[in-house]
Interface confidence: low
């Protein structure tokens, strides 16, 4: 049966006994700035190109052992959510991965900046179709990271980021607080904001919309055919990156403003239980859960 | 991580001691009425003191960025400080990433073309 998260983002007009979403996103390249990935996983094999970009801090602790499957875990799962053969949103999208997070899932603002610069330079050297950049990471508010995101967005790149898993105002974090970035919070199968231990999804006016982010089935780096369930605003952001890729593939000339408008337009409205949010944040937090456009307007590429 | 350590870690073999250059004496004064600002992460445990992103004004060319970085190294060297330019930015934002002592911030903020300086900080998978 179709995983709950894919069903949630799929409008009724797609639905049949079997989940067969359009093979969308084929005109779009999605850049993933995350951990290293297992590019030969069957979910993403041939769909993800690992760039030679790597800018990560050393792992903390003298006893830390780099285990490939652990190092690749976060990025592999997200690549699968975006474009995985079985459990991906935009099955036609091609991806490029940049390593900006170490085996502990930690990176730096400077490393992320250099990664964004790498993307811009790649875009200038070899202009392709629409670009989506997925930033499934968060740090404290950073003027320079927000500024770099703004510049990249003004160059026509769509940036999608995690709202953060701190059960806090997303405006206190970057790149979530960057106005030009599409910032995504996480909801679960019950349309509740996701709780993660004692924390949970961020909220507030810097969040653009929510997407499935709890118990998301995706590629596991434990083996080339393994699947695992992961939760977080990264997973939510990956759904929106996939939806954006499909929309941009359908209409490559969409501006960021139009894309944002359409993401909001096709979202399920007023389904999130707002009682989870602090009272003063309820009116500021968008009650929107991302969804694909009806298939009438999906642009399919049969190659 | 290593990139975010203070210079006191003894890792001097990597660092280049910038010699005083001729152009050090030709430092332009910062534009009148503009003051560069310093920013750092509000979440203390996530701060990475010792590494700084020096952001230059929008229209600054790569050659000016490189020149400003060299000037910083030269002026720091005169004061007995080691610095290392880790990356020169161009394409998105003009500027450079420098590994240096926080003692040099005041000096760096007065360099020509500087818009603001931000201390590096951690980001995390979500």
């Amino acid at each position: 049966s179709i995983p709950w998260n894919l069903e949630r983002i799929t409008p009724p007009r797609y639905r049949a006994d079997e989940y067969q979403p359009p093979d969308g996103g084929s005109l779009v390249e999605v850049y993933l700035l995350d951990t290293s990935i297992q590019s030969d996983h069957r979910e993403i094999e041939g769909r993800v190109m690992v760039t030679d970009f790597e800018n990560v801090p050393e792992e903390d602790g003298t006893r830390f052992h780099r285990q490939a499957s652990k190092c690749d875990s976060h990025g592999t799962h997200l690549a699968g959510v975006v474009s995985g053969r079985d459990a991906g949103v935009a099955k036609g999208a091609s991806m490029r991965s940049l390593r900006v997070l170490n085996c502990q899932g930690k990176g730096t603002v400077s490393g992320t900046l250099i990664g964004l610069e790498f993307i811009r330079k790649s875009q200038l050297v070899q202009p392709v179709g629409p670009l989506v950049v997925l930033l499934p990471l968060a740090g404290g508010y950073s003027r320079v990271l927000n500024a770099a995101c703004q510049r990249l967005a003004r160059a026509g790149v769509v940036l999608v980021t995690a709202a953060g898993n701190f059960r806090d105002d997303a405006c206190l974090y970057s790149p979530a607080s960057a106005p030009e970035v599409i910032t995504v919070g996480a909801t679960n199968a019950q349309d509740q904001p996701v709780t993660l231990g004692t924390l949970g999804t961020n909220f507030g006016r810097c969040v653009d919309l929510f997407a499935p982010g709890e118990d998301i089935i995706g590629a596991s780096s434990d083996c080339s055919t393994c699947f695992v369930s992961q939760s977080g605003t990264s997973q939510a952001a990956a759904h929106v990156a996939g939806i954006a890729a499909m929309m941009l593939s359908a209409e490559p000339e969409l501006t960021l403003a139009e894309l944002r408008q359409r993401l909001i337009h096709f979202s399920a409205k007023d389904v999130i239980n707002e009682a989870w949010f602090p009272e003063d944040q309820r009116v500021l937090t968008p009650n929107l859960v991302a969804a694909l456009p009806p298939s009438t307007h999906e642009n399919l590429y049969f190659q | 991580g290593a990139m975010g350590q203070e210079d006191e870690d003894g890792d001097y073999e990597e660092l280049v001691l910038a010699l005083r250059s001729e152009e050090d004496g030709l430092a332009e004064a910062p534009e009148h009425g503009t003051t560069a600002t310093f920013h750092r992460c509000a979440k203390d445990p996530w701060r990475l003191p010792g590494t700084y992103v020096v952001v230059l004004k929008e229209e600054t060319h790569l050659s000016q960025s490189e020149r400003t970085a060299r000037r910083l190294q030269a002026q720091a060297a005169r004061r007995g400080y080691l610095t290392k330019i880790l990356h020169v930015f161009h394409g998105l934002l003009p500027g450079f990433l420098v590994k240096m002592s926080g003692d040099l911030l005041e000096l760096a903020l007065k360099l020509p073309h500087v818009d603001y300086i931000e201390e590096d900080s951690s980001v995390f998978a979500q």
Epitope: A250, E251, S295, T296, H297, E298, N299, L300, F302 | -
Partner: antibody, heavy 119, light 109 residues
Framework: EVQLVESGGGLVQPGGSLRLSCAAS????????MSWVRQAPGKGLEWVAN????????YYVDSVKGRFTISRDNAKNSLYLQMNSLRAEDTAVYSC????????????WGQGTMVTVSS | QSVLTQPPSASGTPGQRVTISCSGS????????VNWYQQFPGTAPKLLIY???RRPSGVPDRFSGSKSGTSASLAISGLQSEDEADYYC??????????FGAGTKLTVL
């Protein structure tokens, strides 16, 4: 320039059949849902049917279900409407339209072909 | 009987602002975007407004659309004689049909 040109209209007796064609040019035809919209003389617009990019999904207005069949040939950049058991109330100008891939809209229209059902 | 309800006619003098309404239900306008088409006699309709309020390129900014609940409206400001035409609203419906209004004939007095 994107163009849709309809053909195949004409005068037919009630109960008769017609096959309308629409030739598309200037667009990647296989990327779009396509529709037929009709307009009876002096009346408003009425959507008739539409078809998915690969032909795997088709929808019809209730009044033509079981009588009309929409189809397409992507290799020929062509859209068709097979009309059987025609009735007087099917008399209209039939236009082929492209459904935009965004925004729920018919963004390109053909000039239409007239179908008259009369004895 | 059209699924969407429009006034059969509307009129205004040059320079005036004219509004045409379109009423539907939760299965169409209430949950979908609305489009407006302009049709001159003997010609094919032209997309005027899509996604409630967006103008395709080439459509003057005198034309604007809005939606509230299960109703939508088309406003034409600075009315000009060349705006005399038929105007249709349309939306996708949960019944898996496109639905149109019966059309409004705009007369410029």
């Amino acid at each position: 320039e994107v163009q849709l040109v309809e053909s195949g209209g004409g005068l037919v007796q009630p109960g008769g059949s017609l096959r309308l064609s629409c030739a598309a040019s200037g667009l990647t035809f296989s990327n779009f849902w396509m529709s037929w919209v009709r307009q009876a003389p002096g009346k408003g617009l009425e959507w008739v049917a539409n078809i998915k990019q690969d032909g795997s999904e088709k929808y019809y207005v209730d009044s033509v279900k079981g009588r009309f069949t929409i189809s397409r040939d992507n290799a020929k950049n062509s859209l068709y409407l097979q009309m059987n058991s025609l009735r007087a109330e099917d008399t209209a100008v039939y236009s082929c339209t492209r459904e935009s891939n965004w925004g729920f809209a018919f963004d390109i229209w053909g000039q239409g072909t007239m179908v008259t059902v009369s004895s | 009987q059209s699924v969407l309800t429009q006034p059969p006619s509307a009129s205004g003098t040059p320079g005036q602002r004219v509004t045409i309404s379109c009423s539907g239900s939760s299965s169409n306008i209430g949950s979908k975007t609305v489009n407006w088409y302009q049709q001159f006699p003997g010609t094919a309709p032209k997309l005027l407004i899509y996604s409630n309020n967006r103008r395709p390129s080439g459509v003057p900014d005198r034309f604007s659309g809005s939606k509230s609940g299960t109703s939508a409206s088309l406003a034409i400001s600075g009315l000009q004689s060349e705006d005399e035409a038929d105007y249709y609203c349309a939306a996708w419906d949960d019944s898996l049909n496109w639905v149109f209004g019966a059309g409004t004939k705009l007369t410029v007095l």
